[in-house]
Amino acid sequence: EEELQMIQPEKLLLVAVGESATLNCTVTSLLPVGPVLWFRGVGPGRELIYNQKEGHFPRVTTVSDLTKRNNMDFSIRISSITPADAGTYYCVKFRKGSPENVEFKSGPGTEMALRAKPSAPVVSGPAARATPEHTVSFTCKSHGFSPRDITLKWFKNGNELSDFQTNVDPAGQSVSYSIRSTARVVLAPWDVRSQVTCEVAHVTLQGDPLRGTANLSEAIRVPPTLEVTQQPMRAGNQVNITYQVRNFYPQNLQLTWLENGNVCRTETASTLTENKDGTYNWTSWLLVNTSDQRDDVVLTCQVKHDGQLAVNKSLVLEVSAHQKDQSSDATH
């Protein structure tokens, strides 16, 4: 006679919360005589899931009619799956015995794992801004997914990044898992308009990955380049000092004019022009009257950008010897 085989064709069954799960089990022989029971887990602590002869199993139904004499299909359907239902299910053949039935053979088992989608990835940037050529870290987090296998990729402006580290927790068996990945990005001066994207692919997403993004504008500080020029005015006794602050980001910038070390004007950048790369330019003017100056004037422009240390740029306005003579005459 043919030896009994217990066939559980699925090694793994992925089921979403609330769905029904069908656990398949067929036998190759009607002998020996005795019932087929379903258990979750192995060993003495295993949990009885279904016994046709006795017990109450309201969420379990059989796929075939087990009362038929030649039935060889012992598949069951469990309704309204919850996270507590995860585990490995075994169909087990018992041989009729007295006073008790004796376990004869077990199927290989079907692992039921919850199929849960990962949450939308959340990307967070560094706590403080950094300047171009420096490296900043971005973190991507997603949670609540199952099974554990997941793929995460990083992109900057659509180009894949390679410098990142990813962890999936917990390491062992769990109802659901979370992923955390940190990517390192080297900032370029034109990255104000750049974007980093974290892409998560999972079996539950049917090939349509989830994405989270962060703007590098939140992470970058582009310090200004400074240029000071002077132009004599038509009147002859006035000089127009032009101070150009170029290619800075973010836009919070304060400019202080000092004449021989004394503050003569403080401005906050307002009417800015925006460059194509997202940085800003600003021009400030100061009209200096040289007619009442006896000595050379040291004009200093102090720029404080985004709470950083002030940067100074000075210009010496030379008063002509003729003016010096006139000034000294005026003091007698």
Epitope: W190, V192, S194, Q195, K276
Partner: antibody
Framework: QVQLVQSGAEVKKPGASVKVSCKAS????????IHWVRQAPGQGLEWMGW????????NYAQKFQGRVTMTRDTSINTAYMELNRLRSDDTAVFYC???????????????????WGQGTMVTVSS | DIQMTQSPSTLSASVGDRVTITCRAS??????LAWYQQKPGKAPKLLIY???SLETGVPSRFSGSGSGTEFTLTISSLQPDDFATYYC????????FGQGTKLEIK
């Protein structure tokens, strides 16, 4: 799909102003600069300037500075181009166009224009 | 300002012909050049960017080459749909277009 839809044709008198709209759909409006290009009848294409819909920042071609104003309304994904003090030689088709990429891949940050509106004919005549 | 000069201004050709349009820049623009096709009453359509990259959905009979100051647009086998005006555009320093080349049926 990604598209830019412009307002209808306009007839204006010399000295008047015209405001052309350009409604974006199918993509993130604030992610890409919008440019304006004009084309006089039987002539070539002339770049007028751009607007960054995210910040509202603009840059105008020297020729149009002081006469053109580009604005946007992010709540309705629409960019506008207003040209003042119209002359008869401003008679042209005005196009809005979107850049191919929404980021900078090089210092100048300039890029080609791959999505165009259908054009708005503006006729300036007394 | 960078000037762009296209030649020829008008080109007569037949279906199946191989045609070449040239664009010259007044100074080096590296590879920052695009080619557009425009039909009467329609908006320009991007064909080639970065001198030689084919825009998505554009037939492979269109190709671009060149760098620095000399650029060409080639149509390997002219189709009835290709009769139009073609413009080159530099985007190395702001934006300037060539004056256009009208491709007409011989």
């Amino acid at each position: 799909q990604v598209q830019l839809v412009q307002s209808g044709a306009e007839v204006k008198k010399p000295g008047a102003s015209v405001k052309v709209s350009c409604k974006a759909s199918g993509y993130t409006f604030t992610g890409y600069h919008i440019h304006w290009v004009r084309q006089a009848p039987g002539q070539g294409l002339e770049w007028m300037g751009w607007i960054n819909p995210n910040s509202g920042g603009t840059n105008y071609a020297q020729k149009f500075q002081g006469r053109v104003t580009m604005t946007r309304d992010t709540s309705i994904n629409t960019a506008y181009m207003e040209l003042n003090r119209l002359r008869s030689d401003d008679t042209a088709v005005f196009y809005c166009a979107r850049e191919r990429v929404g980021y900078c891949s090089r210092p100048s940050c300039l890029d080609d224009l791959n999505i165009w509106g259908q054009g708005t004919m503006v006729t300036v005549s007394s | 300002d960078i000037q762009m000069t296209q030649s020829p201004s008008t080109l007569s050709a037949s279906v199946g012909d191989r045609v070449t349009i040239t664009c010259r820049a007044s100074q080096s623009i590296s590879s920052w050049l695009a080619w557009y096709q425009q039909k009467p009453g329609k908006a320009p359509k991007l064909l080639i960017y970065k001198a030689s990259s084919l825009e998505t959905g554009v037939p492979s009979r269109f190709s671009g080459s060149g760098s620095g100051t000399e650029f060409t647009l080639t149509i390997s086998s002219l189709q009835p749909d290709d009769f139009a005006t073609y413009y080159c555009q530099q985007y190395d320093s702001y934006y300037t277009f060539g004056q256009g080349t009208k491709l007409e049926i011989k």
